[in-house]
């Protein structure tokens, strides 16, 4: 694949990841009622974030915002955070790596400044989807415990009034937003990894170049017995190299100046 | 304002399936479930189950579940009941109801009274 | 199914007195999600079909008279007229609003004296 195919590729999957991340952040539905017993409730609960919502069979939804910030789990507040992180490095990134791609020119941005910045948005994306990642399953073990926590309570010491009266407990398993958010996650960290994979195909070749400043002679050069090649580039392969005023390019280099099929 | 209009009696043989209507408006009528309730003389309330006008999704009273069946015609904003194989014991005022909060039924028809004889 | 048990199942006051009437349920109508307890009452007269009183086991609805009062939480429920008017004869019916079957009580008859 090519160094452009995989920048543009690793920006747009990071993008898509990046969009779902901020998506799971603000869905409702991180935890879910469990309907297992009862597949069909006529209150249907479910919590996310930052607001807990009530859906009647009646078709009326009522949701309350979590007013208060001390009366918060920790964990909650965690996972809070780590999402918010994961966004915030994600437009970081975004930005940065819109700058880095190579289709795009900016004054006389070289292609060593574009490796950096390749390279910065995709630590950038890695550490988001990474983010994103822990913060999600931070919350999902968060709901196992819960549940298994709920579920021995409904089998012990049922209900009061010597046991006439159940008391209806309320289970939560994963929500949409769990799902989106793994997913999300996962293809901004693949997006960061393409980007530092491109990355390594926008830096130019130093060694291959810089070690040697004379020009071998042409006598030298027939006395050598076999191997040592004038650039000394130690063994690497130069083969799709090609010299222009004494610095280095690769032949997708060669196609850096826009034309109109750059732009898509 | 809101109404939901049902014949005022019908009388139907025994065996004989009979289709009770409910005829909505003053309302969106596919944004509110229609539920119907059976109440025999000088007795209580019966939910027997609910359907949803938009994609006519139903739930039912297992008690009634191969008794009624719950159907909507939604150009003419129109709820039906059909109940199968109709014996005395099916001779009640079937209500039907809009659903509100709370699961709540906050408009009522008139009621049919359904006579089942021969 | 959750059983709903009305106590008394009827009761005669004169007009101008406080009454209160008891439902109970065999399982708890509080949903945790929202703090609301779905249990909702119905008032019927005779000959016609019951209306709405009180949903959420104590919100009013609309055009109901504030002498009405519904309270209570979990599976104890309160429905007070506090103070009877002739009008208010009618058979009382609370119902199960938390989880199908949809169940009612079987009644508290109200007369007046």
């Known amino acids: 694949m090519s160094v452009t195919a995989c920048q543009g590729l690793g920006f747009v999957v990071s993008l898509i990841g990046f969009a779902g991340i901020i998506a799971a952040t603000c869905m409702d539905q991180w935890s879910t009622q469990d309907l297992y017993n009862n597949p069909v409730t006529a209150v249907f609960n479910y919590q996310g974030l930052w607001r807990s919502c009530v859906r009647e069979s009646s078709g009326f939804t009522e949701c309350r915002g979590y007013f208060t910030l001390l009366g918060l789990p920790a964990m909650l507040q965690a996972v809070r955070a780590l999402m918010i992180v994961g966004i915030v490095l994600g437009v970081i990134g975004i930005l940065v790596s819109i700058f880095a791609l190579k289709c795009i020119r900016i004054g006389s941005m070289d292609d060593s400044a574009k490796a950096k910045m390749t390279l910065t948005s995709g630590i950038l994306f890695i550490i988001s989807g990474i983010s994103a990642i822990i913060g999600v399953s931070v919350f999902a073990n968060m709901l196992v415990t819960n549940f298994w926590m709920s579920t021995a309570n409904m089998y012990s010491g049922m209900g009061g009034m010597g046991g006439m009266v159940q008391t209806v407990q309320t289970r939560y398993t994963f929500g949409a937003a769990l799902f989106v958010g793994w997913v999300a996650g996962g293809l901004t960290l693949i997006g960061g990894v393409m980007m530092c994979i491109a990355c390594r195909g926008l830096t130019p070749d130093d060694s291959n170049f810089k070690a040697v400043s004379y020009h071998a002679s042409g006598q030298n050069v027939a006395y050598r017995p076999g191997g040592f090649k004038a650039s000394t580039g130690f063994g690497s392969n130069t083969r799709n190299k090609k010299i222009y005023d004494g610095g280095a390019r690769t032949e997708d280099d060669e196609q850096s100046h826009p034309t109109k099929y750059d732009y898509v | 304002q809101v109404q939901l209009q049902q014949p005022g009696a019908e009388l139907v043989r025994p065996g004989a399936s009979v289709k009770l209507s409910c005829k909505a408006s003053g309302y969106t009528f596919t944004s509110y479930w229609i539920n119907w309730v059976k109440q025999r003389p000088g007795q209580g309330l019966e939910w027997i189950g609910n359907?949803?006008?938009?994609?006519?999704?139903?739930n039912y009273n297992q008690k009634f579940k191969d008794k009624a069946t719950l159907t909507v015609d939604k150009s003419s904003s129109t709820a039906y009941m059909q109940l199968s194989s109709p014996t005395s014991e099916d001779s009640a005022v079937y209500y039907c109801?809009?659903?509100?909060?709370?699961?709540?039924?906050?408009?009522w028809g008139q009621g049919t009274t359904l006579t089942v004889s021969s | 199914d959750i059983v709903m048990t009305q106590s008394p199942s009827s009761l005669t006051v004169t007009a101008g007195e406080k009454v209160t009437m008891s439902c109970k349920s065999s399982q708890s109508l509080l949903n945790s999600g929202n703090q609301k307890n779905y249990l909702t009452w119905y008032q019927q007269k005779p000959g016609q079909p019951p209306k709405l009183l009180i949903y959420?086991?104590?919100t009013r609805e609309s055009g109901v008279p504030d002498r009405f009062t519904g309270s209570g939480s979990g599976t104890d429920f309160t429905l007070t007229i506090s103070s009877v008017q002739a009008e208010d004869l009618a058979v009382y019916y609370c119902q199960n609003d938390y989880s199908y079957p949809f169940t009612f009580g079987s009644g508290t008859k109200l007369e007046i004296k």
């Open positions: 959420w086991a104590s």
């Open positions: 359907i949803y006008p938009s994609d006519s999704y139903t």
């Open positions: 109801t809009r659903s509100w909060r709370g699961n709540s039924f906050d408009y």
